[in-house]
Interface confidence: low
């Protein structure tokens, strides 16, 4: 929707005479009528499909037009339109004379035309005004004109409708090509979405206006990060709302059973270790020389028999001494010096003398280790799972658990990118070696399919009422020439019906 | 909030016009178009036509062409809508309807108002 | 003879599933979003679902819309028994250019 605008500047006609050449008497009162529509490469007569126009009687002769109402008549012309402007146009303007005051056609003389001009070509929306001088053998006219969009209309061609508005519907302005550009605070596609404060959890909570934070039940904090966990839980916590799970060492429901005794009481003494046994139950493992249930008694400390392999016990003012006997050696006499008579390598490990078989190394089968073969080798120590995948020991056998996207045994195999469904528009997919080509309909380009392509606006057959459909090459839009009696963008409209649908 | 009062119950005669009124209330009257719906009594929802309060221009189903006339008063915040010509089968509840609508395109009666009931009887 | 298609009744117990079909055409629901409205008897309309399943505020999420094609269905899980009222379906139609609706759902909880 957008207005034609026609600013009549100065006409001449110095020996005041009409188009056939006859003299006016006594001078030639001057009025103009103005005809636009859809172009032409040959201007030729026939409805005003754009729309028409007549001033008042602006002057005789020559005279220079005031750019303000003149007359009753207003200066600039106005010729409201209420479809896409096409970009293009032709213009007739007819200067006559008014021998009386009836300026109706029926009501003038079929000789009283002065001049008339014509022109056609193309013209774009825009604030300025182009300026054209039109002389025939008599007349000069000199003019400009310009489209430009009506209120809350926007866009190269007056086709996209903005109205601003700070209501539960939406809070924006328009941009000079349409779009909305939302008030500080609002988000979205039409701006109906609050901006919630900064750190808001996208999930848990939510706001109605902006810089607001609203926790969803079972979330608090400013932030809405915290969960509420179920009443009565004591010593637990959670990660998603009525949750209470159990801080270490706490049990029930409620976490209110003590299951880590040791930690909160610490019962044992002189050092023992404390080991949880249950509810409110333990064990305490006494060190050398202590005895009772929480090695609250000391004892001889060669009572226990602390020294291995033969070795002899001698108390000691701070604690005791074990002699060894030939071959042991250690604290507690438990370290041997072996060799590889003594078959020291567990597993089927192969031994080998070292110094002058003074000591020893073992060479370990597969799947074992350690400086006598004792240890089992983790499988997943060498990482065999492809693609970020994680090593999960499970008995005699490895396995890999994979990332999303990714499957097979060591998560090696693409999962088909076209599982997505990533074409746009009813685009077929096809699996490449390294990602997806899309095949796209007619209508429809680009590497997804988003992008739509030239098509013929007029093939719906949009126009009603028997109404000529032109297409608009350039912006794959469409101008209906609408017959006598009927308009709007697509002619849908008995004269007298403005349109104004919101949709 | 958002109100629309109708004008109370008709009773006209065959031929007759009436004009029935809806004052808006509770947001900016200029900003939402409003629509004229009837029901007959026992039927369903008939859409009439729509009004834009801003400039006033309007747009009428094809069926109510030349007998219906939608009106406005914005210092009143009001829109009227006026049919002639009644005979006995507009005998309906005729409601307003504020409609709010973005590029998507959709109809949204979103707002209504509490309805009038016009009876065409000789 | 309303332009979208409904059935005139539907019926369901407290606490079933129940659903409201609205059949139309490519120049109405086929191109156009769909909304659905409640009407209990002597009171005006009110909207229950907007482009197709949206739900205004206010509304219980029992009540869910959906679209496919030319054709429009509405669910309501959980029946309640004051649920009991005449649904419509309505479109904007491209040809004539206007609201369309479909002619009432009777709806009774037994």
């Known amino acids: 929707s957008g207005v034609f605008q026609l600013q009549l500047q100065e006409f001449i006609n110095e020996r005041g005479v009409l188009a056939s050449g006859r003299p006016c008497e006594p001078g030639c009162r001057t009025f103009f009528r103005v005809c636009l529509k859809h172009f032409q490469a040959v201007v030729s007569p026939g409805p005003c499909t754009f729309g028409t126009v007549s001033t008042p009687v602006l002057g005789t002769n020559s005279f220079a037009v005031r750019d303000d109402s003149s007359g009753g008549g207003r200066n600039p012309l106005q010729l409201p339109f209420n479809f896409t402007w096409p970009g293009t146009f032709s213009l007739i303007i007819e200067a006559w004379h008014a021998p009386g005051d009836d300026l109706r056609p029926e009501a003038l003389p079929p000789d009283a035309l002065i001049s008339k001009i014509a022109i056609q070509g193309s013209l774009a929306v825009g604030q300025n005004w182009l300026l054209d001088e039109q002389t025939s053998t008599l007349t000069r006219l000199r003019y400009s004109y310009r489209v430009i969009c009506s209120d809350n209309y926007y866009g190269d061609n007056c086709s996209r409708l903005c109205k601003k508005r700070n209501d539960h519907f939406g809070h924006y302005v328009c941009q000079p090509d349409g779009n909305l550009s939302c008030l500080p605070g609002w988000t979205g596609e039409y701006c109906q979405q609050p901006i919630c404060l900064s750190g808001c959890h996208e999930q848990n909570g939510y706001c109605s206006k902006p810089a607001e934070c609203l926790c969803r039940p079972g979330w608090q904090g400013r932030l809405c990060n915290e969960c509420i966990p179920h009443n009565g839980c004591r010593h637990g916590t959670c990660s998603t709302p009525w949750q209470c799970t159990c801080d270490e060492g706490w049990g029930g429901l409620f976490c209110d059973q003590d299951l880590n005794y040791c930690t909160h009481h610490s019962p044992c003494k002189n050092g023992a270790t404390c080991s949880n046994s249950g509810q409110r139950s333990y064990t305490c493992t006494c060190r050398p020389g202590y005895t009772g249930v929480d090695c609250e008694l000391e004892l001889s400390e060669c009572d226990s028999n602390p020294c291995r392999n033969g070795g002899s016990c001698k108390d000691q003012e701070d604690g005791y001494h074990c002699l060894c006997p030939p071959g042991y050696y250690g604290l507690h006499c438990e370290h041997s010096t072996l060799s590889c008579a003594d078959s020291p390598c567990f597993n089927g490990g192969s031994c080998r003398e070292r110094n002058q078989g003074a000591n020893y190394a073992c060479e370990c089968p597969p799947n074992f280790t350690g400086s006598n073969c004792e240890k089992k080798v983790d499988r997943c120590t060498s990482n065999p799972c492809a693609n970020g995948g994680q090593c999960l020991n499970r008995g005699p056998s490895r396995m890999c658990r994979c990332r999303p996207g990714f499957t097979g045994t060591y998560c090696e195999l693409h999962v088909s990118d076209c599982a997505r469904n990533p074409c746009a528009h009813g685009g077929t997919c096809h699996d490449l070696e390294n990602g997806l080509m899309c095949t796209c309909p007619a209508g429809f380009s680009g590497r997804r399919c988003e992008v739509r392509t030239s098509i013929d606006a007029c093939a719906s057959s949009p126009c009603f009422n028997r109404a000529t459909c032109y297409t608009d090459l350039s912006t794959d839009t469409f101008v209906c020439n609408c017959p006598y009696g009927f308009v709007g963008s697509r002619c849908e409209f008995p004269v007298g019906l403005p349109p104004s649908f919101p949709w | 909030q958002v109100q629309l009062v109708q004008s109370g119950s008709e009773l006209k005669k065959p031929g007759a016009s009436v004009k029935v009124s809806c004052k808006a209330s509770g947001y900016t009257f200029t900003s939402y178009y409003m629509h004229w719906v009837r029901q007959v009594p026992g039927q369903g929802l008939e859409w009439m036509g729509i009004i834009n309060p801003s400039g006033g221009s309007t747009s009428y189903a094809q069926k109510f062409q030349g007998r219906v006339t939608m009106t406005r008063d914005t210092s009143t915040s009001t829109v009227y809508m006026e049919l002639s010509s009644l005979r006995s089968e507009d005998t309906a509840v005729y409601y307003c309807?504020?409609?709010?609508?973005?590029?998507?395109?959709?109809?949204?009666?979103?707002?209504w108002g509490q309805g009038t009931l016009v009876t065409v009887s000789s | 003879q309303s332009v979208l298609t409904q059935p005139p009744s539907a019926s369901g117990t407290p606490g079933q599933r129940v659903t409201i079909s609205c059949s139309g055409s490519s120049s109405n629901i086929g191109s156009n979003t769909v909304n659905w409205y409640q009407q209990f008897p002597g009171t005006a309309p009110k909207l229950l679902i907007y482009r197709n399943n949206q739900r205004p505020s206010g509304v219980p999420d029992r009540f869910s819309g959906s679209k496919s094609g030319t054709s429009a269905s509405l669910a309501i899980s959980g029946l309640q028994s004051e649920d009991e009222a005449d649904y419509y379906c309505a479109a904007w139609d491209d040809s004539p250019n206007g609201p369309v609706f479909g002619g009432g759902t009777k709806l009774t909880v037994l």
């Open positions: 309807a504020t409609d709010y609508y973005d590029s998507s395109g959709y109809v949204d009666f979103d707002y």
